[in-house]
Amino acid sequence: MAVTACQGLGFVVSLIGIAGIIAATCMDQWSTQDLYNNPVTAVFNYQGLWRSCVRESSGFTECRGYFTLLGLPAMLQAVRALMIVGIVLGAIGLLVSIFALKCIRIGSMEDSAKANMTLTSGIMFIVSGLCAIAGVSVFANMLVTNFWMSTANMYTGMGGMVQTVQTRYTFGAALFVGWVAGGLTLIGGVMMCIACRGLAPEETNYKAVSYHASGHSVAYKPGGFKASTGFGSNTKNKKIYDGGARTEDEVQSYPSKHDYV
């Protein structure tokens, strides 16, 4: 039961995380105009990975896409790439994890296959989360660098007569969404990996030792059970020594893994 809960929770957390990564990637507010001493501004600028926008205080908002690839900063391209890789890996991970869920029956899929798929999706979620966190962090670092550079020459004047106020940018909402979403995807991935350990059938089977008492044919077989999840996950143990000993399946009929959907 605990494995199923862990796997299910990992899936849900990752799903929320990937949805957040997609949302952050699409959001326009990766960087927003720093209002420093001017909380009320007539023209408010903000920028995303794909377009820059201007919101005028009168209510008019205009966004313009970056219709160039070569003209964009390499860092922005890198951030775009990291976020897209994160989304793609996360989406594939979600697809794999759906089939790996214990509560979903697909043909006669073995627990070992589900365990492998759970591990695969878990790793994909971890890498996806790391990509998102890395992308957002690279962008944040870029902002911090530019912020202090523009602060250094905040006012450039022509003989001190004409002032040109340079627009400074600070962290936008998308950065925080991205960090949280990346973290959730990472946590979801870790949970899937933990769930995988509980799903995987143990390979170590101990040989049965038969004790033949006079007039009886009773077998004592120590340690032949695998770690049970308590949710019908026991697989049939092979009959290793047939000296009148019976396998667990012959002794007690356990519910099939396919009985729970």
């Epitope: 007539a42 023209v43 600028n45 903000y46 201007v54 005028e56 009168s58 209510g59 106020v165």
Partner: antibody, heavy 118, light 113 residues
């Protein structure tokens, strides 16, 4: 097309509060515009007093900020101006205007002359 | 506050001739986010409210004759009436629409010579 009409007393005594209302027709006061008050003393230039925007946020001219209040009544589709402690220098034609793209004043009321005199 | 200074204060031009009004701001009105200059031009005839002519320094408002054009960037702007008509006699104002408080120039009176 949005139409604006100012209304209020044409004469106000010094030190009293000037109150004007602008009634909006042909559009909603809650729509994506800013609703401004601008004044023009006789024979002089234009002075922006302040605005209330689509979300109810206000911005005022610092030179008048301590005396000005702009509010709105969405149910009546009106916005109003209150200017306290008036003096003869506040005698002007008061316009209400709508601003949108380019923060430019697109639609204007006809204006109402307010004279401050005892 | 951004100070807007118009020149000349008054201008007399013959019908059909070009009229040019200048406007200078004490601070740049260019917004780096969209590379637009937040300068607006208005026309005011006697006894009437001002009428919007040009916004974003060079974008003509719909319904405004194409003889009116705006140009300039940063701190220096120009309104040009390519061929003055009798109905263009009015006072013209430029406005800072970039930074609060929004401020107007003192106005330029255009008359027929």
């Amino acid at each position: 097309q949005v139409q604006l009409q100012e209304s209020g007393p044409g004469l106000v005594k010094p030190s009293e509060t000037l109150s004007l209302t602008c009634t909006v027709s042909g559009g909603s006061i809650s729509s994506n515009y800013a609703w401004n008050w601008i004044r023009q003393p006789p024979g002089k230039g234009l002075e922006w007093i302040g605005y209330i925007n689509y979300s109810g946020n206000t911005a005022y001219n610092p030179s008048l900020k301590s005396r000005v209040t702009i509010s709105r009544d969405t149910s009546k589709n009106q916005f109003s101006l209150k200017l306290s402690s008036v003096t003869a220098a506040d005698t002007a034609v008061y316009y209400c205007a709508t601003s949108y793209y380019g923060n430019s004043f697109i639609y204007w009321g006809q204006g109402t002359l307010v004279t401050v005199s005892s | 506050d951004i100070v807007m200074t118009q020149s000349p204060d008054s201008l007399a031009v013959s019908l059909g001739e070009r009229a040019t009004i200048n406007c200078k701001s004490s601070q740049s009105l260019l917004n780096s986010g969209n590379q637009k200059n937040y300068l607006t031009w208005y026309q005011q005839k006697p006894g009437q409210p001002p009428k919007l002519l040009i916004y974003w320094a060079s974008t003509r408002e719909s319904g405004v004759p194409d003889r009116f054009s705006g140009s300039g960037s940063g701190t220096d702007f120009t309104l040009t009436i390519s061929s003055l008509q009798a109905e263009d006699v009015a006072v013209y104002y430029c406005q800072n629409a970039y930074s609060f408080p929004w401020t107007f120039g003192q106005g330029t009176k255009v008359e027929i010579k």
